[in-house]
Interface confidence: low
């Protein structure tokens, strides 16, 4: 209890202070003295919980002394001045510095007053996300990879996607002692529908103001998926030329288109122009099955279309496009 007639003095400090690995940090600590109160501070002391002896002392006549003089410094205390600010700066923060510290004022006539501060040592992680290029496997494989390197505490990684998929996360010690590298794989059964779609890796960490979002554009390599368009079942004799298109989706891109029929090579009225097939006017009915064969680096696939050119008045029908 303070002696009769004295108001109490209070030590003010935050309960927790964050600092970054390798950086410097100030542990703030102030003595709040009521108006008209006579208070004499003879010594400022900092000690770490669980360790004997003081790490930093500032004496009213002898000045400062430190357990590690290159790493500690009273930021405001000066000989000959009133000792009201015990704030201590720590340089080159290490993992081992994390812990509870006591800031203590030795005062007269009130006695000793102290407060505890928790120093939390953080390391801001570096985050990267990359695609894992895959082929059609028929089973779940990692399709994207998100890495948060050198965080303390470890970052939390989650994935956002409307494609389904499953996260698989692992941790290893980081390059700097006390840090952690978190790797998260996003796993899904590859399909052509997934190729070119995006997934987002979200990384959360105490040192971030808001979560970091990293977008990965998925790559699935697959052989061509082929269809033929441009035929509407209404082609008649005497109409002008028409065009069929061989529509192919593939990754990588198609390297070649080859048109043929079930009977062998193309008939004279059909002229191949890459992905397109020009159908010239004919003077007798036709019933032919056309084949488009598309090749890419992973293989070849084909589509078939049976085309009929029928007798009948072209004026009454939509058909081969007119000029």
């Amino acid at each position: 209890w303070p002696p009769p007639g004295t108001g109490d003095v209070v030590v003010q400090a935050p309960t927790q202070v964050p600092g970054f690995l390798g950086d410097s940090v100030t542990l703030p600590c102030y003595l709040q003295v009521p108006n008209m109160e006579v208070t004499h501070v003879s010594q400022l002391t900092w000690a770490r919980h669980g360790e004997s002896g003081s790490m930093a002392v500032f004496h009213q006549t002898q000045g400062p002394s430190y357990s590690e003089s290159k790493r500690l410094e009273f930021v405001a205390a000066r000989l000959g001045a009133e000792l009201r600010n015990a704030s201590l700066r720590m340089f080159g923060l290490r993992v081992e510095d994390e812990g509870n510290y006591t800031c203590l004022f030795v005062t007269f006539p009130q006695g000793s007053r102290s407060v505890d501060i928790w120093l939390r040592v953080l390391a801001k992680p570096q985050n990267t996300a990359e695609v894992q290029k895959v082929q059609l496997t028929g089973e779940p494989v990692p399709m994207a990879r998100c890495v948060s390197t050198g965080g303390r505490p470890p970052a939390q990684i989650t994935w956002h996607s409307d494609l389904g998929g499953m996260p698989n996360t692992s941790q290893v010690p980081g390059f700097l002692s006390g840090t952690v590298t978190v790797t998260s794989l996003w796993i899904l059964v590859p399909s052509s529908q997934v190729d070119g779609k995006n997934v987002t890796c979200k990384v959360e960490h105490e040192s971030f103001e808001k979560p970091q979002l990293l977008t990965v554009n998925l790559t699935v390599y697959y052989p061509p998926e082929v269809s033929i368009s441009g035929y509407d079942n209404n082609w008649y004799l005497g109409q002008n030329e028409a065009t069929l298109t061989c529509d192919a989706r593939s990754n990588p891109e198609p390297t070649g288109y080859n048109w043929s029929t079930t009977m062998g090579p193309l008939p004279p009225f059909a002229v191949a122009q890459g992905a397109q097939l020009l159908i010239r006017p004919v003077d007798k009915p036709i019933n032919t099955t056309l084949i488009c064969n598309v090749t890419n680096a992973l293989g070849a696939r084909q589509a078939e279309l049976t085309v009929q050119v029928k007798e009948g008045p072209p004026s009454e029908h939509s058909g081969i496009s007119r000029n």
Epitope: H160, T169, S170, Q171, T200
Partner: antibody, heavy 115, light 107 residues
């Protein structure tokens, strides 16, 4: 201060459906997944699933697929869980929580399914 | 699904004691484990994440350790307000799974 306000206790008949709500206050609703957890004396804590309110993306525990449907309304910062074709097995306390870096859970909604 | 086997189910203790609760995962979950405390009639409250990191405001008598498949929550110098049920939970893979719980009671 983060707060999660869950809807009040429900007493419902078997075979019906119920929609529980969870209003989030004090943080950016669209930044964090909202998870739902079931608690019973027999099975303890069971994770039902999660929704990311920003994108609407969901993930479910296979056990609760077809039973629970998760939705979120960004304008009111409210997450919902609808439970269908209720049986006595669905009687439990249901919690919502953003989990991960946040410690906060709702106060829980007690659901009783009984004739 | 990953099973989290928690032991013991019940534990009797006295104020000032040191107690440990263990959780064994059925497969490697790195350090992706959270420990929760749940007092009677209340919601669970997270104490530890990433196996060993205390949430701010959690007293330092609560310590988490372990990685891979074996995890421990230790309470040194048990206080009366620590009497509660404790759960572990893995978040390495969906579905997230919890341990069955350990009830801490007074002798």
């Amino acid at each position: 201060e983060v707060q999660l306000q869950q809807s009040g206790a429900e007493l419902v008949r078997p075979g019906t459906s119920v929609k529980l709500s969870c209003k989030a206050l004090g943080y950016t609703f669209t930044d964090h997944e909202m998870h739902w957890v079931k608690q019973t004396p027999v099975h303890g804590l069971e994770w039902i699933g999660t929704i990311h309110p920003g994108s609407g993306v969901t993930a479910y525990n296979q056990k609760f697929k077809g039973k629970a449907t998760l939705t979120a309304d960004k304008s009111s910062s409210t997450a919902y869980m609808e439970l269908s074709t209720l049986t006595s097995e669905d009687s439990a306390v249901y919690y919502c929580t953003p989990l991960w870096l946040r410690r906060d859970w709702g106060q829980g909604t007690t659901l009783t399914v009984s004739t | 699904d990953i099973q989290m086997t928690q032991t013991p189910k019940f534990m009797s203790t006295s104020v000032g004691d040191r107690v440990s609760v263990t959780c064994k995962a059925s497969q490697n979950v790195a350090t992706n484990v959270v420990w929760f405390q749940q007092k009677s009639g209340q919601s669970p409250k997270a104490l530890i994440y990433s196996a060993s990191y205390r949430y701010s405001g959690v007293p330092d008598r609560f310590t988490g350790s372990g990685s891979g498949t074996d995890f421990t929550l230790t309470i040194s110098n048990v206080q009366s307000e620590d009497l509660a049920e404790y759960f572990c939970q893995q978040y390495n893979n969906y579905p997230l799974t919890f341990g069955a719980g350990t009830k801490l009671e007074l002798k």
